[in-house]
């Protein structure tokens, strides 16, 4: 990862974030969508 | 294998207050990769180090930290190995030394930015 | 908006004792261990010492040292030399979906004697 000259904490960190956003906007959207239906 | 800073200069980036300035930070002696992230933060004259945000190289996502509020904007180019930032609306209070940090782990030499009339 | 208080905010030691600091966070880090240490030299930018709260940097001597998880965290500094006067700043990786991101504590200033 960058020639070896960072750990791979960051990325890992950064890639978990996303994941988290992804679900949130995910689930955010269903939500919204059963809220809608009702 | 380091990070050179440029836009306000080590010896002093003057601005007016209201001003704006753009500060670039290149990456040198080794090639970023998507998940690459350049981070910003700063440092007032005699004060801790303040967090302003990080941008990924690959996608462009960015984040902020909450006292931000817009006046400043993050972007790269991944192609030229570079991250910059844009300072808009500036106060005296933003004077500081102003860093840019791969990964928050490898650090640029800083730019001083000096906002006063 | 998180908190990392950083204590004390300055301490002196003799060449060859220990030094420890310590960072409280409010709330807690990300995962419970992604905190990291840096050292800062006058007119120099910051030096990666420790991430995860525990793993050395790399070129990093291993007089220092770090522990802690959740909200409380320590760095030592053992056998210290003159060269390790400097000031010692935490970093904290938090949740970006409820808080910033990162935040960085107040700072501690060692003197060496």
């Known amino acids: 990862h960058s020639d070896g000259i960072f750990t791979d904490s960051y990325s890992r960190y950064r890639k978990q974030m996303a994941v988290k956003k992804y679900l949130a906007a995910v689930l955010g959207k269903r939500y919204k969508q059963r809220v809608k239906n009702k | 294998q380091q990070l050179e800073q440029s836009g306000g200069g080590a010896e002093g980036g003057l601005v007016k207050p209201g001003g704006s300035l753009k500060l670039s930070c290149k990456a040198s002696g080794f090639t970023i990769s998507r998940d690459y992230w350049i981070c910003w933060v700063r440092q007032a004259p005699g004060k801790g180090l303040e967090w302003i945000g990080c941008?990924?190289?690959?996608?462009?996502?960015?984040d902020y930290a909450n006292w931000v509020n817009g006046r400043f904007t993050l972007s790269r180019d991944i192609d030229q190995s570079t991250g910059c930032l844009q300072l808009n609306s500036l106060t005296d209070a933003d004077t500081a030394m102003y860093y840019c940090?791969?990964?928050?782990?490898?650090w640029g030499q800083g730019t001083l930015v000096t906002v006063s009339s | 908006a998180q908190v990392l208080t950083q204590t004390p905010s300055s301490v002196s030691a003799a060449v060859g004792g220990t030094v420890t600091i310590n960072c409280q966070s409010s709330?807690?880090?990300?995962?419970?261990?992604?905190l990291s240490w840096f050292q800062q030299k006058p007119g120099q930018p910051p030096k990666f010492l420790i991430y995860?709260?525990?793993k050395l940097a790399s070129g990093v001597p291993s007089r220092f040292s770090g522990s802690g998880s959740g909200t409380q965290f320590t760095l030592t500094i053992s056998d210290v030399q003159c060269d390790d006067a400097a000031t010692y700043y935490c970093?904290?990786?938090?949740?970006?979906?409820?808080?910033?991101?990162?935040?960085f504590g107040g700072g501690t200033e060692v003197v060496v004697k």
């Open positions: 940090a791969g990964n928050l782990e490898i």
């Open positions: 970093l904290g990786f938090y949740d970006c979906s409820s808080v910033d991101c990162h935040a």
């Open positions: 709330p807690s880090i990300y995962s419970g261990a992604f």
């Open positions: 995860e709260a525990s």
């Open positions: 941008i990924s190289a690959g996608g462009g996502s960015t």
